[in-house]
Interface confidence: medium
């Protein structure tokens, strides 16, 4: 369905508010260092231009592609070369190479200051003074720090952000009302960003076949009553939506996401009984609700899979004649029967099934060869089950902070070349799996845990790709998307690693430690723990525990002292000396 003017088409479909929000997000994700005012100016210019095209689709330049229009606009930024260096060279290219160039320069770890939350009264004043600017600033600040954030979902977060201020700035106790809501939005936002980053990595590094396989498995778990053809249609549409968003085509992505939500709500009967409450909501909320909807109940009378996929004499015929359809149907049938399995496990099983058919359908007696294929699945199923069981037991025994520390030690020993801030960030997030998943009933633990770990390990892969330092990390990240987690789990102590020389400066602390929040204190201690392991990779758990206990005691003592700085200056070197002796 072609339009004379793409920009007019999207403006009319999305409406001015969403159009402006999405263009701001797109520009902020591309030019992450540009000041807010510059982006607002560019967005206003694009919006005015779009309005002229709505009035007359034949007007000059209205027939240009969105990439051409947006790219031309970004390339008018005066300080492009000074601020972005070689990214400015993108502007010498023609579309579609120019957009690809901009995409390649998106920075997953931009050098931006952490967002500081002002006093509640200050925020409420800013909100009341200029609500529109306040909300635009939110979109800008989140988008530039999370260049792959799912744009239509960010509009939903902004709507919730607005609602929180509208409600709480009227409340008697503004802070008690607002702060928990902002904490929730921040945490949910980080999680949403990380989940979307995995989808984009899946599409960009492993292709749309990998993404479609993921989507077949996940949607079959969610919608076990839907027929395969219905799931396939949803997968095709969902792949288009995410391909567009990951490719920077945010207007098309948001428009297609709205169409998908409309389709799902019009076809609830053939998809899931759980969609009803989502479909009564307004657009942004509806799309979010549909994405997060709980699994429908499994049909009661599902027959055994063995009949069609093991016992049938037509297995090789069906596989040969339509490989991807046959494997897709296998994945659909397996996933709808197993909401208790992680998506990654289901994909491993499909991969194992494919490998067996490749081998057996070429053999003299195919049927005899693949007759035991389901037995081969057992070790693949037991591995994540055991992993979840062991780690949940460890989490329950240690609590979150000490569980994170155990993971910090484990991962630093596996890949000590990785930077300390990355190891701390990734291990802290890996450790959050405990609180998130271990409290769930058995049937929900594995999908929660393993699919969450895949998201966190993708963050490690993305950061490592920017500055590669470890062949082991590169291997685990690039060889197989579905086997990333087992690959990292299987890594042992890196025997080839040359321990880092001891640097007393790394273990020198000051009185400012005492004013830090609990979380910031933990990060400081965990940073020291990683550095200790890098210095002594073969240190035992007991040795490390002893040093960390001494560290906590030393910090506590000095933070209670009258002259805190003098205490740190005096006790610090003693702590360092004692630690070196303990680890010798």
């Amino acid at each position: 369905d072609t339009h004379k003017s793409e920009v007019a088409h999207r403006f009319k479909d999305l409406g001015e508010e969403h159009f402006k929000g999405l263009v701001l997000v797109a520009f902020s994700q591309y030019l992450q260092q540009c000041p807010f005012e510059e982006h607002v100016k560019l967005v206003n210019e694009v919006t005015e231009f779009a309005k002229t095209c709505v009035a007359d689709e034949s007007a000059e330049n209205c027939d240009k592609s969105l990439h051409t229009l947006f790219g031309d606009k970004l390339c008018t930024v005066a300080t492009l070369r000074e601020t972005y260096g070689e990214m400015a060279d993108c502007c010498a290219k023609q579309e579609p190479e120019r957009n690809e160039c901009f995409l390649q320069h998106k920075d997953d770890n931009p050098n931006l200051p952490p967002l500081v939350r002002p006093e509640v009264d200050v925020m409420c004043t800013a909100f009341h003074d200029n609500e529109a600017t306040f909300l635009k600033k939110y979109l800008y600040e989140v988008a530039r720090r999370h260049p792959y954030f799912y744009a239509p979902e960010l509009l939903f977060f902004a709507a919730r952000y607005k609602a929180a201020f509208a409600e709480c700035c009227q409340a008697a106790d503004k802070a008690a009302c607002l702060l928990p809501k902002l904490d929730e939005l921040r945490d949910e936002g980080k999680a949403s960003s990380a989940k979307q980053r995995l989808k984009c990595a899946s599409l960009q590094k492993f292709g749309d076949r990998a993404f479609k396989a993921w989507a077949v498995a996940r949607l079959s778990q969610k919608f076990p009553k839907a027929e395969f053809a219905e799931v396939s249609k949803l997968v095709t549409d969902l792949t288009k939506v995410h391909t567009e968003c990951c490719h920077g085509d945010l207007l098309e992505c948001a428009d297609d996401r709205a169409d998908l939500a409309k389709y799902m709500c019009e076809n609830q009967d053939s998809i899931s009984s759980k969609l009803k409450e989502c479909c009564d909501k307004p657009l942004l909320e509806k799309s979010h609700c549909l994405a997060e909807v709980e699994n429908d109940e499994m049909p009661a009378d599902l027959p055994s899979l063995a009949a069609d996929y093991v016992e049938s004499k037509d297995v090789c015929k069906n596989y040969a004649e339509a490989k991807d359809v046959f494997l897709g149907m296998f994945l659909y049938e397996y996933a709808r029967r197993h909401p208790d399995y992680s998506v990654m496990l289901l994909l491993r099983l499909a991969k194992a099934y494919e490998a067996t058919l490749e081998k057996c359908c070429a053999a003299a007696d195919p049927h005899e060869c693949y007759a035991k294929v389901f037995d081969e699945f057992q070790p693949l199923v037991e591995e994540p089950q055991n992993l979840v069981k062991q780690n949940c037991e460890l989490f329950e025994q240690l609590g979150e902070y000490k569980f994170q520390n155990a993971l910090l030690v484990r991962y630093t020993k596996k890949v000590p070349q990785v930077s300390t801030p990355t190891l701390v960030e990734v291990s802290r997030n890996l450790g959050k799996v405990g609180a998130k998943c271990c409290k769930l009933p058995e049937a929900k633990r594995m999908p929660c845990a393993e699919d969450y770990l895949s998201v966190v390990l993708n963050r490690l892969c993305v950061l490592h790709e920017k500055t590669p330092v470890s062949e082991k990390v590169t291997k685990c990240c690039t060889e197989s998307l579905v086997n990333r987690r087992p690959c990292f789990s299987a890594l042992e102590l890196d025997e080839a690693y040359v321990p880092k020389a001891f640097n007393a400066e790394t273990f020198t602390f000051h009185a400012d430690m005492c004013t830090l929040s609990e979380k910031e204190k933990q990060v400081k201690k965990q940073t020291a723990l990683v550095e200790l392991v890098k210095h002594k990779p073969k240190a035992t758990k007991e040795q490390l525990k002893g040093v960390m206990d001494n560290f906590a005691a030393f910090v506590e003592k000095c933070c209670k002292a009258d002259d805190k700085e003098a205490c740190f200056a005096e006790e610090g070197p003693k702590f360092v000396a004692a630690s070196q002796a303990a680890l010798a």
Partner: nanobody
Framework: EVQLLESGGGLVQPGGSLRLSCAAS????????MGWVRQAPGKGLEWVST????????YYADSVKGRFTISRDNSKDTLYLQMNSLRAEDTAVYYC?????????WGQGTLVTVSS
Amino acid sequence: EVQLLESGGGLVQPGGSLRLSCAASGFTFDNNAMGWVRQAPGKGLEWVSTISANGNATYYADSVKGRFTISRDNSKDTLYLQMNSLRAEDTAVYYCAKGFRRFDYWGQGTLVTVSS
């Protein structure tokens, strides 16, 4: 080193026949399923047919069923594709490939043109 060398392509009229051959070397031919894949001008790859290692089982795409026959001679390490009742839409480069459906090696291809 695995080598697959196709031959037998050429220009043929609609309704005519051709027989493609593929000489294989560098691997144990009779341990491997083999297949044919084609690519029409400006189109993507399309699977045509597969034969099991011992030649007992053969598989065809719907578009060629009843017209094409895949066979092999394990003593000569050679794969064949007999193409009858050829149509204009069969015009393509035909590749011989090693594997069942997840082909790991391909030949250079032989061009088949069906035109009056």
